[in-house]
């Protein structure tokens, strides 16, 4: 399957949240590359 | 909620000038390539340009290469098309859209916005 | 260029009919995306990448296809599927529409 830039993000937020209540740790973001736009893409999610 | 505005339509003679704006809020827009589509006053839908999230990637059909320039402001939120050479057949409403793909899928422009209307008439 | 043809310009249905909507490439596309518009309106994405719904698409719609030919599916026609529907190649550039095809309810 592929993945969709959603649920990264919303996943990311989780353990970014996990991160600061269980270990301390304070992560302030992700560097997204930027991509060309994907022409081999296949069908299907 | 997602929103995109267009702005900068306006009536102008061939071989004129216009610069469209595209506001957008709602979600964090250096992560989205974004694209124009205009609709032709038959209704016909037609791809104008595409520029990825960080704005490396710049894409054109045949049609308007060379005369359109899609550019992007992302401490701004604002997308923007730079026309010039305009010709009759230019005339539409130019919709901006947000374009949700990545390095190896395509889920399509899944925003909208309201559109601007752009008539080339002398 | 890569043509994309909607043979069936307006098409009308009946409510609780199965409706299917056609959409045909020039040459081989990996996937298809369809657009909703409904007049006065901007399209809305409506079923991206050949057969996935996008959000608040009502589940009697469905999509499929592969190569040269696609098509959306609803199930039981309502009064509010009637709207242009309009098929979008991204397999290759430039990108390109199909001119529509206008559903009315009967």
């Known amino acids: 399957g592929t993945i969709n830039v959603h649920d990264v993000e919303t996943q990311f937020n989780q353990y970014k949240t996990e991160a600061a209540s269980r270990y301390n740790l304070t992560i302030s973001d992700v560097s997204v590359s930027d991509v060309p736009f994907p022409f081999s893409a296949q069908s299907g999610a | 909620e997602v929103k995109l505005e267009e702005s900068g339509g306006d009536l102008v003679k061939p071989g004129g000038s216009l610069k469209l704006s595209c506001v957008v809020s709602?979600?964090?827009?250096?992560?989205?390539?974004m694209s124009w589509v205009r609709q032709t006053p038959g209704k016909r839908l037609e791809w104008v340009a595409t520029?990825?999230?960080?704005?490396?990637?710049?894409y054109y059909p045949d049609s308007v290469k060379g005369r359109f320039t899609i550019s992007r402001d992302n401490a701004k939120n604002t997308l923007y098309l730079q026309m010039s050479s305009l010709k009759s057949e230019d005339t539409a409403m130019y919709h901006c859209?947000?374009?949700?793909?990545?390095?190896?899928?395509?889920?399509?422009?899944?925003?909208w916005g309201q559109g601007t209307s752009v008539t080339v008439s002398s | 260029d890569i043509v994309i043809t909607q043979t069936t310009a307006i098409m009308s249905a009946s409510p609780g009919e199965e409706v299917t909507l056609t959409c045909s490439a020039t040459?081989?596309?990996?996937?298809i995306h369809w657009f909703q518009q409904r007049p006065g309106t901007s399209p809305k994405l409506w079923i991206y990448s050949t057969s996935n719904l996008a959000s608040g698409v009502p589940v009697r719609f469905s999509g499929s296809g592969y190569g040269t030919s696609y098509s959306l599916t609803i199930s039981r026609m309502e009064a509010e599927d009637a709207a242009t529907y309009y098929c979008q190649q991204r397999s290759s550039s430039p990108f390109t529409f199909g001119s529509g095809t206008k559903l009315e309810i009967k």
């Open positions: 709602g979600f964090t827009f250096s992560r989205y390539g």
């Open positions: 859209t947000r374009d949700n793909y990545g390095r190896n899928y395509d889920y399509g422009m899944d925003y």
């Open positions: 040459s081989s596309v990996s996937y």
């Open positions: 520029i990825s999230g960080g704005g490396t990637y710049i």
